[in-house]
Structure formats: C-alpha cells, structure tokens
C-alpha cells in the first residue's frame, strides 16, 4: 500500500559537507519495525545512499562505514549525509518501509535537493 | 504580457561568496539603451541590489562600489554578484527595461534562487 | 532621494525664446535618457521629446520640431530644453522626467502671451 | 492615429472598487504606463509595463492588459486616490509617446 512521506524540498549541505533534513512518514498503524533508505535520483536512474532499520525500542543505527547518521521520534526520522562534494548536488529521495508487523506499507517522498559546494582550500601556512 | 526575461531558477554562489547567472531578454525592437536592474525578493518587498545602463556599443558597467558586474551579448546579460554571505540567500530577479529609443519595453524574470553557504574559518597558522 | 528640479519657466512674447533646465540628484543620471512632457492648463499630458542617455541622440514631437532642441551634460547632471520661435499654444507646465517614466519633476510654467 | 481613450471621469464611494479603461482605436502591441496626477501636483507613476507597481505605490493599484484595452483598477479608493489618472503607450503612426486624456476620479462622501 502508498504511504505519504514528506521532505523539504531543498537542503544546503554546510561547508564540511553535511546535510540535514526530515523525513517524516504518515501511518495509521504503530509499526515495531521501520526500515529507512536515502536514494540518490539522477536521470531515471536511482541510486542507494544508505539505508538503516530501527524499531520504536531502539534507536536508528546505520551501517559504520555509511555516509548516514540518523535519530528517529515517532513517525519522523531526522537524517544526516556526511561527505558531500559539489559533484554529489542532486535530488534525495526517502524511502520509508513499515516492515513489521503486517500490513506491509512504502512510500517516498517527492525527494530533496541537496546543494553542495566545494569549500576553497585555505591558504598553506608557512 | 510586456516583454520576456529569462533567468536560471537556481544558482549556488561559490564559496567566496560569489554567485553568476545569464538574464536574457526577449524583445522585437532594437533597443540602443538597456538598463538592466537585479532586485531582491523578500516576501513581497523588492530591494535593489544593483543596477546598470549599458549601450549596444558600450559595455556594461555598474557603479565601482556595487556588489555587481557584469558583460553584455546581445540580447543577454552576464549578471555576477559578489560579496554574499549565508543570509543573503534568496530570490534575485532580472528586471529589463528597454530605455531608448522608444517604445519603453520592461519585462522581469521569475527569479534565480540563490543559495549562499558560509565557508567554515581557516585554523590560525600558527 | 531622487529629485528632478526645473527651472527657467517665464513669461514671454510669442516668437521669443527660452532655455529651461532641469538638474538632477540622487540617481547615476548618465544611466538614464531623459524626457520633456508638457501640460497645458486644464490639460492633459503631451511628450515634447527625449534625449539618449549620451546626448548624441534626440527625437521630438511633431508639434515641436524644428522649433525645440534637448540637451544635456552629464557632469552638470543637467538636461536642457532650448525653444525658440515660442507659439502661444506652447503655453503649458513643462515636466522632465527620466525615460522610463520613473522620475518626475515637479515642472516650471512657461506662459507666452502678448 | 492611435489615440488613447479614457473616461473623463469616474466617481466612486470610500473603500469601492474602480476601475478606469484606456482604449487605443487599434490592437497596440506596446506596453502601458499609468500616472496619478493629484491636484497641484506632477505625474506619479502607479503602473509600468501593464502590471507592474513601483515600490511605495499601494497594492489596492493593480493594471492588466488585453488587447487593445488596458486597465487600471482601485480595491478600495481612498479619500487620498482622488486625482486624475493618465494612460499613456506608444504610438508608431507619431513615432513618440502618447498619453491618455485623462480621467478625474472623484471620492465620494
């Protein structure tokens, strides 16, 4: 079944490369298990950032060596992306899967477009 | 309808604070005189940002201490705004006015949305 | 703040002459071409002609030609219209105003009578 | 000759909604201005290219263009609105600016 999922349409990444936005799900049911996954839209072609599986019990855990950390509260899961370049500007989708118990729900957001810019080397100092 | 004015819905300034954009302008006359205008767009508060009149022989020079420059090809304008910091991120609009000979012809562009990060400090040398 | 200031408005016996002027202030005033539109009393408005924003270019009515000529100096931030062989139709408040219409001035009344 | 045509007058009661016409004999092509004369007072311009308002002119001014009509509307006149009203286009039969002949407006009571 659809489910409506919300995210800002746009987010800056920082100087450092970071980005922050919220994905937030809408469900009639409690789910014990939600699965969230970041793709990256380019063209047709979508491709998976990161992905984390948490329950209402314990907290949002990505894999170590993802680019993703992320805290959940209730039906909103905060996301962060780590090492942006100006060559990963594009558009973020959030996927969000109740995954347990039944009845199985997806949905994905219209997708965030995220804009990065190269910071300009600071000057060696000798 | 007035006259067409097209601009990039989105620019990043780069991280010196620098941001550039084409304004094309759509008019059947051959005007002598252009001044071309970038406003700010605030809710529904229009400020100037810069402003400049330009020949078909001369080229475009805006005041020495305008946060602006620019060059001229025909029918477009090579707008490039300098000097911007995070809290000037928002929407530029090209404003075109056709000033001699007449007819007087003025068209504004949708806006170009721009993004302004601010570069994180450089560590002391020391 | 913006201000276009005429002046030389007179009284003056048809075929005469008169020079009027108008400064400008608070805008690059060598960025824009400027206009001359006059009001006859309980009239409406009527475009006596502009000049381009260099000076090498005029145009003017048909009612004027030949008779009136537009002028400017950029360093004076000053426009000037020069009529000669005045009519007592050319009775009216004389306005500058920049080419687009933004700027007005607040006008100077030439009168010609006899 | 494209001669612009406006009302000579119009009248309207306190907070009303006015609109003033300004016709040219042919389907003009070219942008329109509108100008607020108070009494004693030069032109101010209310409207640019058709629709367009200046900063510091209220948003109870709007213009709009079709076809060979152009239109100036008040949302709600005030006492101070009372003035006379110009159009004014370009006309390639005399090669120059043409204005409209004017509109009174009058607030009524």
């Known amino acids: 079944k659809g489910m409506h999922v919300a995210q800002p349409a746009v987010v800056l990444a920082s100087s450092r490369g970071v980005a922050s936005f919220v994905c937030e799900y809408g469900s009639s049911g409690n789910a014990a298990e939600v699965r969230v996954t970041v793709l990256r839209q380019a063209g047709s072609q979508m491709t998976e950032v990161c992905a984390a599986t948490y329950t209402v019990e314990d907290e949002l855990a990505f894999l170590d060596d993802s680019t993703c950390t992320g805290t959940s509260s209730g039906n909103k899961v905060n996301l962060t992306i780590q090492g942006l370049r100006a060559m990963d500007t594009g558009l973020y989708i959030c996927k969000v899967e109740l995954m347990y118990p039944p009845p199985y729900y997806v949905g994905m957001g219209n997708g965030t477009q995220i804009y990065v810019i190269d910071p300009e080397p600071c000057p060696d100092s000798d | 309808k007035g006259m067409h004015v097209a601009q990039p819905a989105v620019v990043l300034a780069s991280s010196r604070g620098v941001a550039s954009f084409v304004c094309e302008y759509g008019s059947s006359g051959n005007a002598a005189e252009v001044r071309v205008t970038v406003l700010r767009q605030a809710g529904s508060q229009m400020t100037e940002v810069c402003a400049a009149t330009y020949t078909v022989e001369d080229e475009l020079a805006f005041l020495d201490d305008s946060t602006c420059t620019g060059t001229s090809s025909g029918n477009k304008v090579n707008l490039t705004i300098q000097g911007l910091r995070a809290m000037d991120t928002g929407l530029y609009i090209c404003k075109v006015e056709l000033m001699y000979p007449p007819p007087y012809y003025v068209g504004m562009g949708n806006g170009t949305q721009i993004y302004v990060i601010d570069p994180e400090p450089c560590p002391d040398s020391d | 703040e913006v201000q276009l200031v005429e002046t030389g408005g007179d009284l003056v016996k048809p075929g005469g002459s008169l020079r009027l002027s108008c400064v400008a202030s608070?805008?690059?005033?060598?960025?824009?071409?400027m206009n001359w539109v006059r009001q006859a009393p309980e009239k409406g408005l009527q475009l006596v002609g502009g000049?381009?924003?260099?000076?090498?270019?005029?145009y003017y009515t048909d009612a004027v030609k030949g008779r009136f000529t537009i002028s400017r100096d950029n360093a004076k931030n000053t426009v000037y219209l020069q009529m000669n062989s005045l009519r007592a139709e050319d009775t009216a408040m004389y306005y500058c105003a920049t080419s687009n219409f933004q700027y007005w001035g607040q006008g100077t009344l030439v009168t010609v009578s006899s | 000759q494209a001669v612009l045509n406006q009302p000579a007058s119009v009248s309207a009661a306190l907070g009303q909604r006015v609109t003033i016409s300004c016709n040219t004999n042919i389907g003009s092509p070219y942008d329109v201005q509108w100008y607020q004369q108070l009494p004693g007072k030069s032109p101010k311009t209310i409207i640019y290219?058709?629709?367009n308002r200046p900063s510091g002119v209220p948003v109870r001014f709007s213009g709009s263009k079709s076809g060979s009509t152009a239109t100036l509307t008040i949302a709600g006149i005030q006492a101070e609105d009372e003035a006379d009203y110009y159009c004014?286009?370009?006309?390639?039969?005399?090669?120059?600016?043409?204005f409209g002949s004017g509109t009174q407006l009058t607030v009524l009571g």
């Open positions: 000049i381009n924003s260099g000076g090498s270019a005029t």
């Open positions: 290219g058709n629709s």
């Open positions: 608070g805008f690059t005033f060598s960025d824009y071409p």
């Open positions: 004014q286009s370009y006309d390639d039969n005399v090669d120059g600016y043409v």
